[in-house]
């Protein structure tokens, strides 16, 4: 904490500008008015302050807003956001998507920090649900965002938001997460025709039950092996050899390369050898 000292004569800051970079920490503390800083936060990012100087500026804002910063200040924090702790951020009430974008931009290219995770959590909780625009924004900055949420958190995603989800956004989702997302995707895409529906639903099929896979097998979808490998083991096991052959179409030959991996291995083990032989792939049950 910077000691309280009187501001030297002629050094009182009239505005936030480049001259302040030559101020010592104690001079910043004594000569910069917190209210001035708050109204001119947008200028701070254009000035090459040292980390130590930024600490002083943060301290001034903390004193001015002990209950948490107003959104007008938060939106212009820029690199000062990196100085915030999750505890600081928990005091905020961020409602504007523009504010969220501005702060995410500061952290762009880095992994999701505890600060960013707290910010997103505060924002989403404030909105009550993960709407399409928010999801669009978050997955643009963090493709793995959706899969970082718990199944409980994912349950607040409305089916309409599913349209914003790209295949790569689901890459790291586990079965419990896809169990929640799949029914929402099914609902979101229900009015699409067969081939278009399959293109959209494909990424979510890791949460599909056996009945839906059986239905897809009747639609000549030609599922690729990468998608098949992501299916739930318990959904795959009841499928017959004929159903898997129809589901995969020309891709059925790929089963041979995956015969030692789950869920293919478990499925092969549970089939009659005579049925497996009809595939002509040399699979051993």
């Amino acid at each position: 904490e910077v000691e309280k000292t009187a501001c030297p004569s002629g050094k009182k800051a009239r505005e936030i500008d480049e001259s302040l970079i030559f101020y010592k920490k104690w001079e910043l503390e004594a000569c910069v008015d917190a209210a001035l800083l708050a109204t001119q936060m947008d200028r701070v990012n254009a000035i090459p302050f040292t980390y130590e100087q930024l600490d002083v500026l943060k301290h001034k804002l903390d004193e001015l807003y002990p209950q948490g910063y107003p959104e007008s200040v938060i939106q212009h924090l820029g690199y000062l956001f990196l100085k915030m702790s999750p505890e600081d951020i928990r005091k905020w009430n961020v409602t504007s998507l523009e504010t969220l974008k501005a702060l995410l931009e500061v952290n762009k290219g880095h992994e999701m920090s505890p600060q960013v995770a707290t910010l997103i959590d505060r924002f989403v909780k404030g909105r009550g649900q993960l709407d399409k625009d928010t999801l669009d924004t978050l997955t643009a900055f963090y493709p793995g965002y959706l899969c970082s949420l718990s199944p409980e958190e994912l349950s607040s995603v409305p089916p309409s938001s599913i349209w914003a989800v790209r295949p790569q956004d689901l890459d790291t989702c586990d079965p419990r997460q896809l169990d929640v997302l799949y029914p929402k995707a099914r609902l979101a895409f229900q009015n699409m025709n067969g081939s278009e529906y399959f293109v959209k639903i494909q990424s979510f099929l890791g949460g599909a039950p056996t009945e839906d896979l059986k239905a897809l097998s009747q639609q000549n979808v030609s599922m690729d092996l990468a998608t098949f490998m992501k299916l739930r083991t318990d959904a795959v096991l009841p499928l017959t050899v004929a159903e898997v052959q129809k589901l995969l179409g020309p891709h059925v030959e790929g089963l041979k390369a995956e015969e030692r991996h789950r869920p293919v291995r478990d499925w092969i083990l549970r089939q009659r050898q005579d049925d497996l032989d009809t595939l002509g792939l040399g699979l051993q049950g």
């Epitope: 586990d174 079965p175 419990r176 992501k230 083991t233 030692r260 991996h261 789950r262 869920p263 083990l269």
Partner: antibody, heavy 119, light 107 residues
Framework: QVQLQESGPGLVKPSETLSLTCTVS??????????WSWIRQPPGKGLEWIGY???????NYNPSLKSRVTISVDTSKNQFSLKLSSVTAADTAVYYC???????????WGQGTMVTVSS | DIQMTQSPSSLSASVGDRVTITCRAS??????VNWYQQKPGKAPKLLIY???SLQSGVPSRFSGSGSGTDFTLTISSLQPEDFATYYC?????????FGGGTKVEIK
């Protein structure tokens, strides 16, 4: 409630064959849902999977032990067995039998039986 | 074979601590990774299956996460009965492999 119990000699001479049996009670070795494995743990060391068998007789072995291992199943006795040939002192371990559900993992284990290889 | 590398090999912690154990697979194991707890002289006990699903009867302070090659077991608030050795295991590839184990000791 499925329970597993290992049985077999606690002492085996080098170059001989180690034979163990796992008896399944409270469930069936013929269950289509389950795989039946053998796992071992040398004193003070970690776990090593030996192999599994399905009720149909299909087996899968650890490549490092494959040439010496045979796992078989006897559905009439509700048992599955392990044979490990040409043993050496390095095979001294606690041997566990375990059930694996394809959806979970090794959810049920026997209490383990210590096998020492020594002359 | 897929090698499972666990870290740390041992750690000291106090009751109430948050403990994190990691397991790295030499190639993708998708989400087919399980976690076990073993106490001296006892058989291992399944805690977490399919990377993040809690086995029935296991306290909710245990949680798992990860997919692909990096997996984590977390104990949110360590209890006296949690001092044990923990193992990860992959079952994606037909040659099942275990991690080397992490011994959690009392500080």
């Amino acid at each position: 409630q499925v329970q597993l119990q290992e049985s077999g000699p606690g002492l085996v001479k080098p170059s001989e064959t180690l034979s163990l049996t796992c008896t399944v009670s409270g469930g069936s070795v013929s269950s289509r849902d389950d795989l039946w494995s053998w796992i071992r743990q040398p004193p003070g060391k970690g776990l090593e999977w030996i192999g599994y068998i399905y009720y149909s007789g299909s087996t899968n072995y650890n490549p490092s032990l494959k040439s010496r291992v045979t796992i078989s199943v006897d559905t009439s006795k509700n048992q599955f067995s392990l044979k490990l040939s040409s043993v050496t002192a390095a095979d001294t371990a606690v041997y566990y039998c375990a059930r694996e559900d394809a959806l979970t993992g090794f959810d049920i284990w026997g209490q383990g039986t210590m096998v020492t290889v020594s002359s | 074979d897929i090698q499972m590398t666990q870290s740390p090999s041992s750690l000291s912690a106090s009751v109430g601590d948050r403990v994190t154990i990691t397991c790295r697979a030499s190639q993708s194991s998708r989400y087919y990774v399980n976690w076990y707890q073993q106490k001296p002289g006892k058989a291992p006990k399944l805690l977490i299956y399919a990377a993040s699903s809690l086995q029935s009867g296991v306290p909710s302070r245990f949680s798992g996460s990860g997919s692909g090659t990096d997996f984590t077991l977390t104990i949110s608030s360590l209890q006296p009965e949690d001092f044990a050795t923990y193992y990860c295991q992959q079952s994606y590839d037909a040659s099942y492999t275990f991690g080397g184990g992490t011994k959690v000791e009392i500080k």
